[in-house]
């Protein structure tokens, strides 16, 4: 303020709870500041000083005050007082907390209430930052509320969230924070149709969001750098992974994608089945023995189970358990001139491969 020339220059600053006047100290010049509420209800206050500043504190936010400034020269009131009216600003809410639920996409905004008495309520705004394209949303809530929710925010987009205290036609300065709503992840990861080199992966899509696609990533647990990635249409919730390594545990993750933004991955582990031995062959055939040969499966195994019996035989077959290192066995004590059925299963602990079957006559 710059009042009449006979009054020294001074500044007035009004906060939620204080009125402050400041001036450049000068010899024999002082100020007196009187403050009272326009509507009463508080005792008037008066402070005198020649130090260069006067602070009247303890005011109530959002209340109209009349304040009087009187210049003192040699301690005497020489000039007419300056009388002004001011409404202290509303105090904003405090402790703003933002929480975006990645499963539902709902943003919950909560705060601690303003200390301003008799407010009308709160205005809450959500606006994309830096001019990004997206919905700007607004809610007005009653004074007794300290939270509200927003949906329909764009996942992956940064929003500025502001909460204002409102009293009639006045608003506080806002309390603000930013948040990026997460893209909701899929749920309920399942594995079916497990084979030696394939598996079917299914999931449940998140509700109430039109995704761009799903991202499926998979790699052997023991070699997680060897990652393969598939982009799946948002209308699909299953994929068959192929060309996998037999007897190998895979880590599989499925993420929702909204525009360029990914959800947290839904992860699971699944082991492929053992592949069968292959290439059954026979040699050294005699009247009562022959040697069986095979090619080992690709999977890591602990051994084989080899069964043999005459072709039209309903009894219990003879069975040999053979170490993983062997890929042949000589079967003896066979019946001359008889067709034998030989089956070979690869084992890994209690896990079994599909059968490899061959037939040979003595």
């Amino acid at each position: 303020l710059q009042p009449g020339s006979s009054i020294p220059p001074y500044n007035t600053e009004v906060t939620e709870t204080t009125i402050v006047i400041t001036w450049t100290p000068a010899p024999r010049i002082g100020f007196k500041l009187g403050v009272r509420p326009s509507q009463g209800g508080e005792a008037p206050r008066e402070v005198t000083s020649d130090s260069g500043s006067i602070v009247v504190s303890g005011l109530t936010p959002g209340v109209e005050y009349v304040y009087t400034i009187q210049v003192l020269r040699d301690g005497q009131e020489r000039d007419a007082p300056i009388v002004n009216k001011v409404v202290t600003p509303l105090s904003p809410p405090t402790n703003l907390h933002l929480e975006a639920n990645p499963d539902t996409g709902v943003l919950t905004v909560s705060w601690e209430r303003s200390t301003t008495p008799d407010i009308t309520g709160y205005r809450i705004t959500t606006t994309p930052t830096n001019g990004q394209q997206g919905n700007s949303l607004e809610e007005v809530v009653h004074a007794d509320q300290s939270s509200c929710t927003f949906d329909n925010l764009s996942p992956g987009l940064e929003y500025n969230v502001s909460v204002y205290t409102v009293k009639d036609d006045k608003e506080s300065v806002p309390i603000s924070d930013t948040i990026i709503p997460a893209v909701p992840p899929p749920t309920d990861l399942r594995f079916t149709n497990i084979g030696p080199d394939t598996m079917r992966v299914t999931w449940a899509p998140p509700p109430s969001i039109d995704l761009t696609n799903f991202l499926v990533r998979y790699s052997p647990v023991k070699n997680e750098e060897d990652v393969a990635e598939l982009s799946i249409s948002p209308s699909d919730n299953a994929v068959v992974l192929t060309n996998l390594l037999p007897g190998t545990e895979y880590v599989v993750s499925v993420s929702s994608v909204y525009e360029q933004h990914e959800s947290t991955p839904l992860r699971g582990r699944q082991k492929t089945g053992l592949d069968s031995p292959t290439g059954i062959d026979f040699s050294d055939i005699t009247a009562n023995s022959f040697t069986v040969h095979w090619i080992a499966p690709r999977a890591t195994i602990t051994g084989y189970r080899i069964r043999h019996h005459p072709e039209h035989f309903s009894g219990r077959p003879r069975e040999d358990r053979v170490p993983h290192s062997r890929n042949s066995i000589t079967l003896t004590n066979l019946t001359p001139g008889t067709e034998y059925v030989v089956s070979i299963v690869a084992l890994n602990g209690r896990e079994e491969s599909p059968l490899l079957i061959g037939q040979q006559s003595t």
Epitope: E319, R321, V322, P323, S325, R326, L331
Partner: antibody, heavy 115, light 107 residues
Framework: EVQLLESGGGLVQPGGSLRLSCAAS????????MSWVRQAPGKGLEWVSD???????NYADSVKGRFTTSRDNSKNTLYLQMNSLRAEDTAVYYC?????????WGQGTLVTVSS | DIQMTQSPSSLSASVGDRVTITCRAS??????LNWYQQKPGKAPKLLIY???TLQSGVPSRFSGSGSGTDFTLTISSLQPEDFATYYC?????????FGQGTKVEIK
């Protein structure tokens, strides 16, 4: 306690035959593969043959067609029938429990092939 | 057949010494490697299987390590009863084969 006791070794002329036995106790003999391993005097160990729980067999190339391994589960006994013996078959012959990891061994029986 | 090469062929050591014997396979055998101890006139005794697993009843001063083609048997503190010949054996592919042995003698 697992025990394996070989017998049947001795001196034999080249071209001759010998049958070794290995009496097993202290474990369910019929459930395990058994092996024969030999050691020529002052030399290292050499695998000879396996016989699996169902009676199937495997042999080292050096003895294939000459040696036959069999088992009698009712007697808990393992056999090695050695035919067409050669000087290079001279060795201590051990029977061992299981194939691959030979976790128990007999004390061995010496076979000497010499004229 | 897979060739197994042990080194050294023999070594002299004192009681309390740390002794290391190495075994190299001519091709990868994963972890399918066993170690045996044999004393003169006696049968071999399984010490370690699957490269690093101590056989039941074997003292913990014996340990094994390695995979692929290079393996090690270590005796952390040699005891008088440890003077013997040690053999490695591959069980990855048939036929199973042994190293030529390493004789540990008293210095």
């Amino acid at each position: 306690e697992v025990q394996l006791l070989e017998s049947g070794g001795g001196l034999v002329q080249p071209g001759g035959s010998l049958r070794l036995s290995c009496a097993a106790s202290g474990f369910t003999f019929s459930s395990y593969a058994m092996s024969w391993v030999r050691q020529a005097p002052g030399k290292g160990l050499e695998w000879v043959s396996d016989i699996y729980d169902g009676g199937g067999t495997n042999y080292a190339d050096s003895v294939k067609g000459r040696f036959t391994t069999s088992r009698d589960n009712s007697k808990n006994t393992l056999y090695l029938q050695m035919n067409s013996l050669r000087a290079e078959d001279t060795a201590v012959y051990y029977c061992a429990k299981t194939a691959d990891n030979f976790d128990y061994w007999g004390q061995g029986t010496l076979v000497t092939v010499s004229s | 057949d897979i060739q197994m090469t042990q080194s050294p062929s023999s070594l002299s050591a004192s009681v309390g010494d740390r002794v290391t014997i190495t075994c190299r396979a001519s091709q990868s055998i994963s972890s399918y490697l066993n170690w045996y101890q044999q004393k003169p006139g006696k049968a071999p005794k399984l010490l370690i299987y699957a490269a690093s697993t101590l056989q039941s009843g074997v003292p913990s001063r014996f340990s094994g390590s390695g995979s692929g083609t290079d393996f090690t048997l270590t005796i952390s503190s040699l005891q008088p009863e440890d003077f013997a010949t040690y053999y490695c054996q591959q069980a990855n592919s048939a036929p199973t084969t042994f190293g030529q042995g390493t004789k540990v003698e008293i210095k």
